[in-house]
């Protein structure tokens, strides 16, 4: 089932999915002064079986000055909203995607396609969230969100990420250097803190990723 | 079980300094940002300091920014505030809280008077 | 002066349901911040009531919940109980400050 709204945004923050699971969808999306070949697919479905899935169909864009039609953007399936990630920055690189089994990899670029991918969430799809160069994390450990379906309807949970600015340096003449060690928020280590569900992720690429005390959900 | 516990409050003359500690025990702490917050007799709360979770960086409040330092020693899971030039108008009970903050200590008195 | 709005007193019967708003700005709520309210009991400290907007921590009764839109923010007590009666207060992060911003405080009386 498709998730009905966007994962949700956090300021001075991006969100990418290490690995998109069976049925999301990936719209065809050409940049400007491009549009997608006559009969060529509106969208990407990733699918599969109990041991590997891939993405089907493909993407392909071609000049706009070929035919006499000007249309660039792909239109979307009715009762379906956009679904938008932007490329978050190294070193958030996953550790290899294919060992999630039901999930599909980040797809490989098609030639001339549009800056920014706009995918079609399904229940049960988790995106991570780092702050923005020039910003960093008041709490440490993985900021997710995932899609989940509660009482019929889709939601996606809440990550907590706080991302703060331009750091205050010392106020003060020898004041002690600050440890260099991770921030976050309290996770409990007998009992989880209030937002402390989702906090353990079984990746390494989770475990460097910067987060807030918020960033977990109550059971 | 999340605990917090302060201490280092009590009664200082005007221009004099104290130093809180906050002792934390029961999660993570140091994953995890912390702050001061204080409430005067009778009034709201007001967020003094943040810390993030490896002391890297911390804001301050405009009212108490140039005279209170925040830290943390996170070998020792404890917070601390250095309040120095203390004021009447500092007067208050300091709590220490960890995250949104979602847990908070139950308090220090700090009482600035001559 | 606080920088989140709240009404500095609120009132109901038991049984009642009664709404407390919560102010803000583009710096903070309106930024996208998400709100927290926090309810205090007489010579306690602050409890975390409501996370996220609309989250409650366990053990909070679903007779407390809290909403979002724009630059404002409500937390709606259903069924109120005469151990409702405390201060509550919204609290959200704030950009320009660099820190969680509060409300006021209002004060909830159970008549």
């Known amino acids: 089932e498709l998730c009905d709204d966007d994962p949700p945004e956090i300021p001075h923050a991006t969100f990418k999915a290490m690995a998109y699971k069976e049925g999301t969808m990936l719209n065809c999306e050409c940049k400007r002064g491009f549009r997608r070949i006559k009969s060529g697919s509106l969208y990407m479905l990733c699918t599969g079986n109990s041991s590997h899935s891939s993405w089907d169909n493909q993407c392909q864009c071609t000049s706009s000055a070929t035919r006499n039609t000007t249309k660039q953007v792909t239109p979307q399936p009715e009762e379906q909203k956009e679904r938008k990630t932007t490329e978050m920055q190294s070193p958030m690189q996953p550790v290899d995607q294919a060992s999630l089994p039901g999930h599909c990899r980040e797809p490989p670029p098609w030639e001339n396609e549009a800056t920014e991918r706009i995918y079609h969430f399904v229940v049960g799809q988790m995106v991570y969230y780092q702050c923005v160069q020039g910003y960093r994390a008041l709490h440490r450990g993985p900021a997710e969100s995932v899609c989940k379906m509660t009482h019929g309807k889709t939601r996606w949970t809440q990550p907590q990420l706080i991302c703060t600015g331009e750091m205050e340096t010392s106020q003060f003449p020898g004041e002690e250097k600050p440890q260099a060690s991770p921030e976050g928020r309290p996770e409990s280590e007998t009992s989880c803190l209030v937002t402390t569900t989702d906090f353990q992720i079984q990746t390494e690429m989770a475990a460097t990723m910067e987060t807030s005390i918020f960033t977990t959900e109550y059971q | 079980e999340v605990q917090l516990l302060e201490s280092g409050g009590g009664l200082v003359q005007p221009g004099g300094s104290l130093r809180l500690s906050c002792a934390a025990s029961?999660?993570?702490?140091?994953?995890?940002?912390m702050h001061w917050v204080r409430q005067a007799p009778g009034k709201g709360l007001e967020w003094v300091s943040v810390?993030?979770?490896?002391?890297?960086?911390?804001y301050y409040a405009d009212s108490v920014k140039g005279r209170f330092t925040i830290s943390r020693d996170n070998s020792k899971n404890t917070l601390y505030l250095q309040m120095n030039s203390l004021r009447a108008e500092d007067t208050a009970v300091y709590y220490c809280?960890?995250?949104?903050?979602?847990?908070w200590g139950q308090g220090t008195l700090v009482t600035v008077s001559s | 002066q606080s920088v989140l709005t709240q009404p500095p007193s609120a009132s109901g019967t038991p049984g009642q349901r009664v709404t407390i708003s919560c102010t803000g700005s583009s710096s903070n709520i309106g930024a996208g911040y998400d709100v927290h309210w926090y309810q205090q009991l007489p010579g306690t400290a602050p409890k975390l009531l409501i996370y996220?907007?609309?989250e409650r921590p366990e053990g909070v009764p679903d007779r407390f919940s809290g909403s979002k839109s724009g630059t404002s923010a409500s937390l709606a007590i259903s069924g109120l109980r005469s151990e409702d009666e405390a201060d509550y207060y919204c609290a959200a992060w704030d950009d320009s400050l660099n820190g969680p911003v509060f409300g006021g405080g209002t004060k909830l009386t159970v008549l």
């Open positions: 809280a960890a995250g949104v903050p979602d847990y």
């Open positions: 810390i993030s979770y490896d002391g890297s960086y911390k």
């Open positions: 029961g999660f993570t702490f140091s994953s995890y940002g």
């Open positions: 996220s907007n609309n």
